[in-house]
Amino acid sequence: IFKKEQAMCLEKIQRANELMGFNDSSPGCPGMWDNITCWKPAHVGEMVLVSCPELFRIFNPDQDMGVVSRNCTEDGWSEPFPHYFDACGFDEYESET
C-alpha cells in the first residue's frame, strides 16, 4: 500500500511541476515523498499543510487535528510541525505494517 502511495505521489509531483513551471533550477522547494506523505512543490515563503495519511485518520476525522505543515524557506523545506509522531501518532510506515 505504501509503495503505491509513493508512486502516486511522484506522479502528483510531476503534474504539479508542469502546472507550476517548476524545474530543477527553479527557486523554491521541490515536491517530495518523505516516506510518510506527499508534499507538493512550493514557492519560498509558502506554508504547505497535509493531513495525516488516511490510514491513520479513520478514527480521527477532526479538521482541527492530524494536520502537519512545512514551510518552504530559501534553505529548502523546514521540519514538519508538529512532528508526525505528535500529530498522527506514528512516525514511520515500516513500523506500522
Epitope: 477532526d62 487535528m65 501518532g89 513500523s95 506500522e96
Partner: antibody
C-alpha cells in the same frame, strides 16, 4: 489492569547517576501502541516531561532538550520494564519521579502512572 | 518550548458548585490538550484528552472545551472527591509541557 511499579533509591549524591526502574504489569513494554515515559515533579519546576521509549519494529527514544545530554531511557523486554538513568545530578534534580504509559487517541496522553519516587540529591 | 499557563492558581468552592479552570498555551496547539487531576501524595490521573474527550471511567460532570490557545475544564456539581489540583498539558510539540496547576479547595 495496567499497573506500573517503580523502584530505585531515594537518595543520590551530587554528580552521581540517578537510576529508577518501572515494572509493567497488564501490558508489555513492546506494545506497538504505547509509549513509556518518565516525568518528574518539584515545587520549583512543576511537572516536567523528561522523555520516553517505544517500540515500533525497532526501539526509539525521545528526550526533553533540558536533560538530553544526561538522560537514558532503556527498555528491558525480558522483564517487561523500563528504566531511567540521569547522569551528573545536582540538587536541582531533586523531585518526585513518575513513570507513565502513553497512549494515542487523537493525541498522546498519559493514562497510567507509577506511584512516584521521591529522589533527593544531597551529599 | 510551549508555555502553558492556568488560571486561577487556586480557588475555593463548595460541594455542588460549578467551577471552570482556564488553560492557555503560548502558541496554537489545535486540540492537543490533556487534563489531569492530582491529589496530595498521589500520581496525576487522566481526565480528558484531545481537549474534550472524557477518559473512560471519569464521571460526566467533568468536561473540557477549547481549541487553539484557550481551553477550559469545567466541573459541574463539584463532589467531595473533586477537591484536588488540576493540570493541563500540551502534546503537540516535544517537550510536552504542563501548566502550573489549579488547586481547588473547600470553601
Amino acid at each position: 489492569q495496567v499497573q506500573l511499579q517503580q523502584s530505585g533509591p531515594g537518595l543520590v549524591k551530587p554528580s552521581q547517576t540517578l537510576s529508577l526502574t518501572c515494572a509493567i504489569s497488564g501490558d508489555s513494554v513492546s506494545n506497538k501502541q504505547a509509549t513509556w515515559n518518565w516525568i518528574r515533579q518539584s515545587p520549583s519546576r512543576g511537572l516536567e516531561w523528561l522523555g520516553r521509549t517505544y517500540y515500533r519494529g525497532k526501539w526509539k527514544n525521545h528526550y526533553a532538550v533540558s536533560v538530553k545530554s544526561r538522560i537514558t531511557i532503556n527498555p528491558d523486554t525480558s522483564k517487561s520494564q523500563f528504566s531511567l538513568q540521569l547522569n551528573s545530578v545536582t540538587p536541582e534534580d531533586t523531585a518526585v519521579y513518575y513513570c507513565a504509559r502513553g497512549m494515542w487517541n487523537q493525541n498522546w496522553f498519559l493514562d497510567h502512572w507509577g506511584q512516584g519516587t521521591l529522589v533527593t540529591v544531597s551529599s | 518550548d510551549i508555555q502553558m499557563t492556568q488560571s486561577p492558581s487556586s480557588l475555593s468552592a463548595s460541594v455542588g458548585d460549578r467551577i471552570t479552570i482556564t488553560c492557555r498555551a503560548s502558541q496554537k496547539i489545535a486540540r492537543y490538550l490533556v487534563w489531569y487531576q492530582q491529589k496530595p501524595g498521589k500520581a496525576p490521573k487522566l481526565l480528558i484528552y484531545a481537549a474534550n474527550m472524557l477518559q473512560s471511567g471519569i464521571p460526566s460532570r467533568f468536561s473540557g472545551s477549547g481549541s487553539g490557545t484557550d481551553f477550559t475544564l469545567t466541573i459541574n456539581s463539584l463532589q467531595p472527591e473533586d477537591f484536588a489540583t488540576y493540570f493541563c498539558q500540551q502534546s503537540i510539540q516535544q517537550p510536552y509541557t504542563f501548566g502550573p496547576g489549579t488547586k481547588v479547595d473547600i470553601k
